[in-house]
């Protein structure tokens, strides 16, 4: 068997909403996913899961299931969204992101994706993890691969 | 408005140990992290610890563990930075502060320590 | 423990002047990195939070820059107020560091 190729895009969109009471941050973050089939057969893409950590802390988690089959030396792009929560000890981000003397509210978040793709009865899994930057101040949308640097974040209303 | 206060110079013998104060007030104390430094004479700042009062969570620089002990009274507010088997070295301004995102952004006044026999 | 290297250790510089200070991470600190200023006998006073965010009440002379491993602190049209020693520090995995400090004396 050929390679299965997994390549973490980036974030597409962060939207974000608040509980003013609790000061918990609700942020639900997209994410982009190209999966490259190099085999001369199908393989189906049985699952995806992801977490989201902030200061080492786990924010959220997702889990796809039963996503799509790749067809051979094909390739598809995939989304997936993790639904995330700062709050409690990480309360004080709230001041953070809804500070309204900045612009741009950026936080540093490390994205884990892990893909199983099946065929023929194997079963393969890839992970990859990737520190990206996300607005927590506004909702935004990102053009693909954007996320990963500081200096070209200018979101998209 | 937010402040630090911390509590006043000390004068102490090598060998023993000292405890200082950094007492909170404007803001919700359980918050926001402390953040305990230290600044020989003249020169840089060192990180020696913090605490976090929403969980108690104490994290130490492994330079200062051993020495320094960090522990909190809820009911004021304050966190306390307690130095033991003092020496010379020792000596030194030691600094409370709110940790912020991507900054400490409130500062206490320092406390003065001299270890000298 | 990541390192901060800060440059230059001092500076001595006329009222009005434009300085750049700098600041290098021994590896990718993601922007959390704060500057401060410190005047003799006094506390240190945060001027930049997360490498490009000014902080409450701090002029707009200053300006914080970089990212990565690279960072810098600009101050435009030095006043005599700014004079005294710059820090920065890092805060993305503990142990925080700090800079070795520029030194502004005034010329």
């Known amino acids: 068997p050929r390679s299965i190729d997994v390549k973490y895009i980036g974030v597409k969109s962060a939207y974000v909403s608040y509980d003013v009471q609790k000061r918990t941050i609700y942020l639900n973050i997209t994410n982009t996913l190209n999966i490259t089939n190099n085999n001369y057969y199908s393989v189906e893409v049985e699952n995806i899961t992801a977490q989201v950590q902030f200061s080492k802390t786990v924010i959220g988690k997702a889990r796809l299931n039963n996503i799509t089959i790749i067809g051979p030396l094909d390739m598809k792009q995939i989304d997936y969204t993790v639904p995330t929560v700062i709050a409690e000890e990480m309360s004080y981000m709230y001041d953070f992101c809804t500070l309204i003397s900045i612009k741009v509210h950026n936080i540093v978040l490390m994205m884990q994706v892990t893909v199983t793709t099946t065929y023929f009865g194997h079963s393969e899994q890839i992970s990859q993890e990737r520190y990206q930057y996300v607005d927590c101040g506004r909702n935004t949308t990102y053009q693909l691969g954007q996320s990963e640097y500081l200096n070209v974040l200018q979101p998209q209303q | 408005q937010v402040q630090l206060q911390q509590s006043g110079a000390e004068l102490v013998k090598p060998g023993a140990s000292v405890k200082m104060s950094c007492k909170a007030s404007g803001y919700t104390f359980t918050t926001f992290p402390i953040e305990w430094m230290k600044q020989n004479h003249g020169k840089s700042l060192e990180w020696i610890g913090n605490f976090h009062p929403y969980n108690d969570d104490t994290k130490y620089n492994e330079k200062f563990k051993g020495k320094a002990t960090l522990t909190v009274e809820k009911s004021s507010s304050t966190v306390y930075l307690e130095l033991s088997r003092l020496t010379s070295d020792d000596s030194a301004v030691y600094y409370c502060?709110?940790?912020?995102?991507?900054?400490?952004?409130?500062w206490g006044q320092g406390t003065s320590v001299t270890v000298s026999s | 423990d990541i390192q901060m290297t800060q440059s230059p250790a001092s500076l001595s510089v006329s009222v009005g002047e434009t300085v750049t200070i700098t600041c290098r991470a021994s590896?990718?600190?993601?922007?959390?990195l704060g500057w401060y200023h410190q005047k003799q006998g006094k506390s240190p006073q945060l001027l930049v939070f997360a490498a490009t965010n000014l902080a409450d009440g701090v002029p707009s002379r200053f300006s914080g820059s970089g990212s990565g491993t690279q960072y810098s602190l600009k101050i435009n049209s030095l006043q005599s107020e700014d004079f005294g020693t710059y820090y920065c520090q890092h805060l993305w995995s503990v142990p925080w560091t700090f800079g070795g400090g520029t030194k502004l004396e005034i010329k």
């Open positions: 502060a709110r940790y912020f995102y991507g900054g400490m952004d409130y």
């Open positions: 590896e990718n600190i993601y922007s959390s």
